[in-house]
Interface confidence: low
């Protein structure tokens, strides 16, 4: 079973609504872990959840807390809680083949669609992650840059296939 | 009774939720009519609603249309309809003391808080506008900059002090 799998809740489904409710040209800063689009998840997941936590916490500050219904604030607040749980879980499992990327995370700007595609990819990694099978080396070409996969459909409603 | 007053509906109340649901540092372009903060409404209202219509229509394109509940798209769509109604109404009343500003509208950048404060001021103008009393000249000092009118209420339901 995937590490920390029990920490991932169905709140992630709210991401669809959140992405639709954010301006398409609004830019979200994320320290992107180089290679997460091509390397196995054990190479980047421990750093990525920390960076996602930071970015989502910062994003939360951009909204006002209104009580009625599903607001952007309430959705992001839930996502922060999910990711913070995963950060804690990763710490608990830090000896279980979760490796540090050899390159430092780089601050990049992403549209909501791009940012939450990375978010989804990270969440999916916990669902699929099996310690025993993750033994490959974490080596990535220095020419890679994030999120340039032409296979990503932008005609789908808002969500967003996992990144290649 | 104010000109076009019957075109102003309670959908405007949704602005509270909309402003809370937009990133505080997101910038919205609006061609601002110089002097609307200090001059009587007949001097600027006819131009301002046209510019608000353009800006809101542009803003609408930044969001996806999701069916469930009050989304940003659905709120902005309602506001576009309100303002477009007012544009038509202004055309019908163009002979009724509605003057053209002597200065051309200038494209400026506003946070959601600022933009919808101007929106609110414009909507209020229709509620308060009485043709007979609006006879003053439309002259504005070149040193003025917009929205410094202490008369603009920031305690109204959705409006909102200027953002940093």
């Amino acid at each position: 079973e995937g590490i920390c799998r029990n920490r991932v809740t169905n709140n992630v489904k709210d991401v669809t609504k959140l992405v639709a409710n954010l301006p398409k040209d609004y830019m979200i800063t994320l320290k992107y872990v180089p290679g997460m689009d091509v390397l196995p998840s054990h190479c980047w997941i421990s750093e990525m959840v920390v960076q996602l936590s930071d970015s989502l916490t910062d994003l939360l500050d951009k909204f006002s807390n209104i009580s009625e219904g599903l607001s952007n604030y309430s959705i992001i607040d839930k996502l922060v809680n999910i990711v913070d749980d995963l950060v804690e879980c990763v710490k608990e499992n830090s000896s279980k083949d979760l490796k540090k990327s050899f390159k430092s995370p780089e601050p990049r700007l992403f549209t909501p669609e791009e940012f939450f595609r990375i978010f989804n990819r990270s969440i999916d990694a916990f669902k699929d992650f099996a310690v025993a099978s993750e033994t490959s080396d974490c080596v990535v070409s220095s020419t890679l840059s994030p999120e340039k996969d032409s296979r990503v459909s932008v005609t789908k409603p808002f969500m967003l296939p996992p990144v290649a | 009774e104010g000109i076009c007053r019957n075109r102003v509906t309670n959908n405007v109340k949704d602005v509270t939720k909309l402003v809370a649901n937009l990133p505080k540092d997101y910038m919205i372009t609006l061609k601002y009519v110089p002097g609307m903060d200090v001059l009587p409404s007949h001097c600027w209202i006819s131009e301002m609603v046209v510019q608000l219509s353009d800006s809101l229509t542009d803003l609408l394109d930044k969001f996806s249309n999701i069916s469930e509940g009050l989304s940003n798209y659905s709120i902005i769509d309602k506001l576009v309809n309100i303002v477009d109604d007012l544009v038509e109404c202004v055309k019908e009343n163009s002979s009724k003391d509605l003057k053209k500003s002597f200065k051309s509208p200038e494209p400026r950048l506003f946070t959601p808080e600022e933009f919808f404060r101007i929106f609110n001021r414009s909507i209020d103008a229709f509620k308060d506008f009485a043709v007979a009393s609006e006879t003053s000249d439309c002259v504005v000092s070149s040193t003025l900059s917009p929205e410094k009118d202490s008369r603009v209420s920031v305690t109204k339901p959705f409006m909102l002090p200027p953002v940093a």
Epitope: - | D25, Y26, Y32, P107, L109, S145, K148, S150, V154, P162
Partner: antibody
């Protein structure tokens, strides 16, 4: 805009800067603090909305500095705690116009952090 | 991040001077230009990339959008010798360029 409160302080110490505003409706404007280390460029430090309801900070000062305002006194404040040598700079208060970024500046007040 | 060039330049009165500012990411038109003289506070010259601030001489002009921006002084005057900063304000934290010092040749 007239700043005051600068001076020499030891590392780890505290200082409170003030900025007295006049000539405009203070509560209608967001205000910011911008600093400039000796011989260096400008660095935005913090901002506060017209009502005081929203505050913003640069990462370099987050958790150490607190911006506030008293609209009844037309005064902007910057409470600086846990000061470091790298906080040494001239601190300017600036008015943030609706469109024009920082359109009015104070003359600045020098803060020196040294043992 | 905002990168200004050149970091300094020497020019004569009457010269046409151009300073460039490049943003690491697109900032549309959310850019201002400031002038600062030694021991003085900065002064706003241009906002929204190309709008001249009230009271600023018309020899100053700004252009550009996206990532590349330019400040032009059409005919340099003695009082224009100073340091010039660009600044973006698409979102906080606002960031300034490192400055361009315009000196007398």
């Amino acid at each position: 805009l007239v700043e005051s409160g600068g001076g020499l302080v030891q590392p780890g110490g505290s200082l409170r800067l003030s900025c007295a505003a006049s000539g405009f409706t203070f509560s209608s404007y967001a205000m910011s603090w911008v600093r400039q280390a000796p011989g260096k460029g400008l660095e935005w430090v913090s901002a506060i909305s017209g009502s005081g309801g929203s505050t913003y900070y640069a990462d370099s000062v987050k958790g150490r500095f607190t911006i506030s305002r008293d609209n009844s006194k037309n005064t902007l404040y910057l409470q600086m705690n846990s000061l470091r040598a790298e906080d040494t700079a001239v601190y300017y208060c600036a008015r943030r116009d609706f469109f024009a970024h920082f359109d009015v500046w104070g003359q600045g007040t020098l803060v020196t952090v040294s043992s | 991040q905002m990168t200004q060039s050149p970091s300094s330049l020497s020019a004569s009165v009457g010269d046409r001077v151009t300073i460039t500012c490049r943003a690491s990411q697109g900032i549309r038109g959310y850019l201002g230009w400031y002038q600062q003289k030694p021991g003085k506070a900065p002064k706003l010259l241009i906002y929204s990339a190309s709008s001249l601030q009230s009271g600023v001489p018309s020899r100053f002009s700004g252009s550009g959008s996206g990532t590349d921006f330019t400040l032009t002084i059409s005919s340099l005057q003695p009082e224009d010798f100073a340091t010039y900063y660009c600044a973006e304000y698409i979102r906080m934290p606002y960031t300034f360029g490192q400055g361009t010092k315009v000196e007398i040749k």
